[in-house]
Interface confidence: low
């Protein structure tokens, strides 16, 4: 009598996370009587993944009715395959008895479950960076396999070279990660700028995934301050103002300060928003010529976004026209004393 | 035929530096994992560097920061820049493949010799 | 790092003998186990990976075996192109480590 045999085809079967999977097992002979069982493994902790003759197993069904007399497939479909489904599955031969008596093993198939990374999630420093500084985003995407995948990064459609990836784990496993982070160096023009994670995998027929994330949650640009000042219909009286300009984000405080003295003090509101995503913003105070005996210094201070102030110093000037047209007698604070004092715009 | 041809051995100083290059034939090598492993004469295989198919490397301790194991997609081949070598480094190099699903070798180059010595 | 010990270090044997070298991981491996051939002035051959399954055109005479720390290769009958040194080496984590190998001598 010939030994029986027990076929498994092939070595390695791969599939797409979803979908079923097909294990082919033939044996030569119906003899001795028994029953045949699937196992995920090998050793004392194998999975039991199919028995012919008791059990409930929803996923697997057999290709063909494992009850004719004359059958020898013994093939599965399991449906619905996850990447916990990875693994080496041995169809094996039972003689019937109490209990049942394993008399031969397939060689196994590797199942290799072919599972999409999950969508890159990009996350930036958590602190905003100045122009000429270098910060750093980094793109995450879990759940792949097999281990092989490409990632690259993007500024403004332009493919970036400075960054580090990494696939864990490092040995075998049923998926993986993928982490890898980018170091971008901010300029001033960067408020628009967006980076991208691109991530390709044989899963994603050719249609890569992509995160994405805006430096103008990283970015910030400083203003530059400018303080000037212009004559008013009334005689004596001048207009000072303060110009903030090219400044991201919009938090932003300015304070006027009369020979260091706090005068005003205003938050940023109806700000100009240029073509690269800064601001400008103007304040501006009226002052009372005459109500002055010595220089006058007026000082624009502006803390942005919670950083520490800067300011721009200012001579209040006199001409000798304005000076004649004050008389003697007059007196009182150099701001004009309108209601507001100052205004912006 | 599946092929890995190792190149750029020969005799260095110590100190010195070395860039080994190993050429693949019959195979994507950016679709594997690939290593080098060295043999000093008359002692057992010893694994150095990987790199894996997403460009993350490996390194065994003794040459971390001295090796930069890295691929060049385009000419089909792998790269060990060795530098700061040492006369412990002094061995046959071999290029390695690792198999497709469980990174175990299967290719192997037919080795290169390094000998550092003054 | 994941130490290997291959025993014997060295074995002498007739051709036609059966023979098995074995290997032990310090913790354990799973299955990722593989055993390589090397004979004197050549590359090394690989044998078997998974502990168990054989690479393309690797004679069946030779055969793996075990899983988690303790592993087995087995050469069935010895014909005079084994004589050489064997190793084995694990691959589930980095550093990837080699035994210290096994000499197959002609007796």
């Known amino acids: 009598e010939e030994e029986l045999q027990v076929i498994q085809p092939e070595k390695s079967v791969s599939v797409t996370a979803g979908e079923s999977a097909t294990l082919n097992c033939t044996v030569t002979s119906l003899i001795p009587v028994g029953p045949i069982q699937w196992f995920r493994g090998a050793g004392p902790g194998r999975e039991l993944i199919y028995n012919l003759k008791e059990g409930h197993f929803p996923r697997v069904t057999t290709v063909l009715d494992p009850t004719k007399r004359n059958n020898m497939d013994f093939s599965i479909h399991i449906s619905n395959i996850t990447p916990a489904d990875a693994g080496t599955y041995y169809c094996v031969k039972f003689r019937k008895g109490s209990p049942d008596v394993e008399l031969k093993s397939g060689a196994g198939t590797e199942l290799s479950v072919r599972a999409k990374p999950s969508a890159p999630v990009v996350s930036g420093p958590t602190a905003r960076a100045t122009p000429e500084h270098t910060v750093s985003f980094t793109c995450e995407s879990h759940g792949f396999s097999p281990r092989d995948i490409t990632l690259k990064w993007f500024k403004n459609g332009n493919e970036l070279s400075d960054f580090q990836t990494n696939v864990d784990p490092a040995g075998k496993s049923v998926s993986y990660s993928i982490r890898s982070t980018a170091r971008v160096v901010l300029t001033r023009r960067d408020v628009h700028s967006q980076v991208i994670c691109e991530v390709a995998h044989v899963t994603l027929q050719g249609d890569p995934l992509r995160g994405t994330a805006n430096l103008s949650e990283a970015i910030r640009v400083p203003p530059t301050l400018e303080v000037f000042q212009r004559p008013m219909r009334a005689e004596n009286q001048v207009n000072v103002t303060c110009q903030v300009r090219k400044f991201y984000p919009q938090r932003l405080l300015l304070t006027w300060l009369e020979n260091g003295n706090v005068s005003q003090t205003e938050t940023a509101s109806t700000l100009t928003e240029n073509k690269d995503g800064t601001y400008n913003w103007r304040s501006w105070l009226l002052v009372n010529t005459c109500a002055h005996r010595d220089g006058v210094v007026l000082t624009c201070q502006v803390e942005h976004d919670g950083q520490p102030a800067v300011s721009k110093s200012h001579a209040l000037e006199v001409s000798a026209h304005q000076k004649e047209q004050c008389s003697d007698t007059t007196s009182g604070p150099v701001l004009a004393p309108t209601a507001p004092l100052g205004g912006s715009g | 035929e599946v092929q890995l041809v190792e190149s750029g051995g020969g005799l260095v100083q110590p100190g010195g530096s070395l860039r080994l290059s190993c050429a693949a034939s019959?195979?994507?090598?950016?679709?594997?994992?690939m290593h080098w492993v060295r043999q000093a004469t008359g002692k057992g295989l010893e694994w150095v560097s990987a790199?894996?198919?997403?460009?993350?490397?490996y390194y065994t301790g003794s040459v971390k920061g001295r090796f930069t194991i890295s691929r060049e997609n385009a000419k089909n081949s792998l790269y060990l820049q060795m530098n700061s070598l040492r006369a412990a480094d002094t061995a046959v190099y071999y290029c390695?493949?690792?198999?497709?699903?469980?990174?175990?070798?299967?290719?192997w180059g037919q080795g290169t010799m390094v000998t550092v010595s003054s | 790092d994941i130490q290997m010990t291959q025993s014997p270090s060295s074995l002498s044997a007739s051709v036609g003998d059966r023979v098995t070298i074995t290997c032990r991981a310090s913790?354990?491996?799973?299955?990722?186990l593989a055993w390589f051939q090397q004979k004197p002035g050549k590359a090394p051959k690989s044998l078997i990976y998974?502990?168990?399954s054989l690479h393309s055109g690797v004679p069946s005479k030779f055969s793996g075996s075990g899983s988690g720390t303790d592993f087995t290769l087995t050469i069935s009958s010895l014909q005079p192109e084994d004589f050489a040194t064997y190793y084995c080496?694990?691959?589930?984590?980095?550093?990837?480590?080699f035994g210290q190998g096994t000499k197959l001598e002609i007796k």
């Open positions: 390695v493949r690792g198999g497709v699903w469980d990174d175990a070798f299967d290719i």
């Open positions: 019959g195979f994507t090598l950016s679709s594997y994992d």
């Open positions: 790199i894996g198919t997403a460009g993350d490397t």
């Open positions: 913790q354990d491996i799973n299955n990722y």
């Open positions: 998974t502990a168990s």
């Open positions: 080496q694990q691959y589930v984590s980095y550093p990837y480590t």
